[in-house]
Interface confidence: medium
């Protein structure tokens, strides 16, 4: 669709005569009839196939025609067409004399014709005017013409329809050739696709308007590049949505069970070494001079009764000191200046001379010990507690305080490592001397049967065209994240061209 425009500029009829040579009375009141038709090698009469237009009386005899387009007038003359411009045309311009006010063809005598010109040729669509001048014996006509496209039509033939829009069907203006020029923030064939926030993740994010980044289920963050862990996940992370992969030192379904009690709680006191031994379980190895489960008790060096022969022990900063009774000397009062004659054996002990009476030895009755039978037998001296248990004297009896992981009267029994059900996926647990062993069911391996060796159901690759597949657990099936240019639940359909323009 377009318009053939004809601009009449000047008509010269100096003698004021008709084509017949007869003069007009009082002068030639001139108007024009224009006929536009398809190209003819020889322009002949017949239907004006491209259109026809007439002017009012524009002047008498010779006159210049005013450009009246700005004032809404009829110069240039408009010959609209509703078809593809063929690029060629034929044009007939007739100048007529109007004796009266009725300009209809049937109201005029045939000899009222002043002049008739006919041209034909090629004419491309464009903004530039073609200037032409046609001269006959008695008249001269100067004019120019061009073909331009109607509003919203573009291209070499005015055949391309393009109407700028900014709505659901597109966001664009039209280029001179009729191609779409997307408004800022929009892209795609019809500028219907918003350009998301720069950096918005291609698969995990999307947008409904420019510079937006909306996250698909399971993703978060400004650019939708952070996965959301399973709800309730405490000390864990994810690499794909809804995971809860525990941080080091944490375990359990929601990574809320402390497996590294030593680091998180520092229970061992006085510089002791801490060792994790299971969930919320630990062992403290005390530095010399300390005891207790957490090495919280200071151990007196006199507690081991180092002074012999009734010597009394005094704690000192750098150790201890023995105060020996009369007749004894040495670091531990181990040397005697006594003999059997001095009755050195206490608690009914028998004295035996040695080295020709230079020293002696006491034979002690039951329940007494020491070089002079001065000490009651300490039931803990034989260290009856196994596995590092602590022996405690309780009057006539004794008891063992066991380290974590051991039990029994003498801490001789291992607490079963299998009691915690450490084998995953129905694995069978076997207690060993130094730990445990899991026998895994088919489809699982690893120290705790934690490694799944069965086929991942996602390996069936339900998504086409290199789409990313993951399961959105809030729906009933897997979700395919389609790359640009594909749609469908499995991304199986390429985005097709619409069958016609969407307006």
């Amino acid at each position: 669709s377009g318009v053939f425009q004809l601009q009449l500029q000047e008509f010269i009829n100096e003698r004021g005569v008709l084509a017949s040579g007869r003069p007009c009375e009082p002068g030639c009141r001139t108007f024009f009839r224009v006929c536009l038709k398809h190209f003819q090698a020889v322009v002949s009469p017949g239907p004006c196939t491209f259109g026809t237009v007439s002017t009012p009386v524009l002047g008498t005899n010779s006159f210049a025609v005013r450009d009246d387009s700005s004032g809404g007038g009829r110069n240039p003359l408009q010959l609209p067409f509703n078809f593809t411009w063929p690029g060629t045309f034929s044009l007939i311009i007739e100048a007529w004399h109007a004796p009266g006010d009725d300009l209809r063809p049937e109201a005029l005598p045939p000899d009222a014709l002043i002049s008739k010109i006919a041209i034909q040729g090629s004419l491309a669509v464009g903004q530039n005017w073609l200037l032409d001048e046609q001269t006959s014996t008695l008249t001269r006509l100067r004019y120019s013409y061009r073909v331009i496209c109607s509003d919203n039509y573009y291209g070499d033939n005015c055949s391309r329809l393009c109407k700028k829009r900014n709505d659901h069907f597109g966001h664009y203006v039209c280029q001179p050739d009729g191609n779409l020029s997307c408004l800022p923030g929009w892209t795609g064939e019809y500028c219907q696709q918003p350009i998301c926030l720069s950096g918005c993740h291609e698969q995990n994010g999307y947008c409904s308007k420019p510079a937006e980044c909306l996250c698909r289920p399971g993703w978060q963050g400004r650019l939708c590049n952070e996965c959301i862990p399973h709800n309730g996940c405490r000390h864990g992370t994810c690499s794909t949505p809804w995971q809860c992969t525990c941080d080091e030192g944490w375990g359990g379904l929601f990574c809320d069970q402390d497996l590294n009690y030593c680091t998180h709680h520092s229970p061992c006191k006085n510089g002791a070494t801490c060792s994790n031994s299971g969930q919320r379980s630990y062992t403290c190895t005390c530095r010399p001079g300390y005891t207790g489960v957490d090495c919280e008790l200071e151990l007196s060096e006199c507690d081991s009764n180092p002074c012999r022969n009734g010597g009394s022990c005094k704690d000192q900063e750098d150790g201890y000191h023995c105060l020996c009774p009369p007749g004894y000397y040495g670091l531990h009062c181990e040397h005697s200046t006594l003999s059997c004659a001095d009755s050195p054996c206490f608690n009914g002990g028998s004295c035996r001379e040695r080295n020709q009476g230079a020293n002696y030895a006491c034979e002690c009755p039951p329940n007494f010990t020491g070089s002079n039978c001065e000490k009651k037998v300490d039931r803990c001296t034989s260290n009856p507690c196994a596995n590092g248990g602590q022996c405690l004297n309780r009057g006539p009896s004794r008891m063992c305080r066991c380290r974590p992981g051991f039990t029994g009267t003498y801490c001789e029994l291992h607490v079963s490592d299998c009691a915690r059900n450490p084998c995953a996926h129905g694995g069978t647990c076997h207690d060993l001397e130094n730990g445990l062993m899991c026998t895994c069911p088919a489809g699982f391996s690893g120290r705790r049967c934690e490694v799944r060796t069965s086929i991942d159901a996602c390996a069936s690759s339900p998504c086409f065209n290199r789409a990313t597949c993951y399961t959105d657990l809030s729906t009933d099936t897997f979700v395919c994240n389609c790359p640009y240019g594909f749609v469908g639940s499995r991304c199986e359909f390429p985005v097709g061209l619409p069958p016609s323009f969407p307006w």
């Epitope: 709800n231 949505p241 379904l253 929601f254 995953a424 934690e450 996602c458 399961t471 099936t477 897997f478």
Partner: antibody, heavy 118, light 110 residues
Framework: EVQLVESGGSLVQPGGSLRLSCAAS????????MTWLRQAPGKGLEWVAT????????AYVESVKGRFTISRDNAKNLLYLQMDSLRGDDTAVYFC???????????WGQGTMVTVSS | QSVLTQPPSASGTPGQRVTISCSGS????????VNWYQQLPGTAPKLLIY???QRPSGVPDRFSGSKSGTSASLAISGLQSEDEADYYC???????????FGTGTKLTVL
């Protein structure tokens, strides 16, 4: 069609064992956290155990710890509950369910009845 | 024994609005999301509300959930006869390391 179907429930004597199965279809089983729940006759709902998608971690209600074991076979789309040392108070309808990412159970089986009685 | 407390029963006439409360503690409702289930007589429970106030597809918008502090509530507007069922609230409990249910509320449509 998305569905879970439990099987294996029966009458068992106290101290006995039973293994329940739950067959999943219509969704990607290997991606789902799975759970067993139960409901004693005329009583409310009780959570029993949950297992992560890869089976790496499990959690149990205190009353069944050491007696029940939840496991799964992703290749066969099956969830299991091995129940040992059964007691009278374990009598209930046992449901398997899929755990949404929000600790919410969106797909439930029809349930299977377990009766512990001498 | 249930950790979350619900009223044992509730009732209303068709078209009315009914609210069911659920009271817990800081270790469950206070620090985790709340879910609601509907159990029609003789059937398996059905998820009604998850993550405090989200409705799964297929659940009418007559059902809505909310949470404040250590309490939650389920509201049913435009009550219908088919809403007659048992309703349970539930949440993960960080102290017990387990999923806890409410005592259940029996809703009667008069």
């Amino acid at each position: 069609e998305v569905q879970l179907v439990e099987s294996g429930g029966s009458l068992v004597q106290p101290g006995g064992s039973l293994r329940l199965s739950c067959a999943a279809s219509g969704f990607t089983f290997s991606n789902g956290w799975m759970t067993w729940l139960r409901q004693a006759p005329g009583k409310g709902l009780e959570w029993v155990a949950t297992i992560k998608p890869d089976g790496s971690d499990t959690a149990y209600v205190e009353s069944v710890k050491g007696r029940f074991t939840i496991s799964r076979d992703n290749a066969k789309n099956l969830l299991y509950l091995q129940m040992d040392s059964l007691r009278g108070d374990d009598t209930a309808v046992y449901f398997c369910a899929r755990d949404l990412a929000y600790n919410a159970f969106d797909i439930w089986g029809q349930g299977t009845m377990v009766t512990v009685s001498s | 024994q249930s950790v979350l407390t619900q009223p044992p029963s509730a009732s209303g006439t068709p078209g009315q609005r009914v609210t069911i409360s659920c009271s817990g503690s800081s270790s469950n409702i206070g620090s985790n999301t709340v879910n609601w289930y509907q159990q029609l007589p003789g059937t398996a429970p059905k998820l009604l509300i998850y993550s405090n106030n989200q409705r799964p597809s297929g659940v009418p918008d007559r059902f809505s959930g909310s949470k404040s502090g250590t309490s939650a509530s389920l509201a049913i507007s435009g009550l219908q006869s088919e809403d007659e069922a048992d309703y349970y609230c539930a949440a993960w409990d960080g102290s017990l390391n387990g999923y806890v249910f409410g005592t259940g509320t029996k809703l009667t449509v008069l």
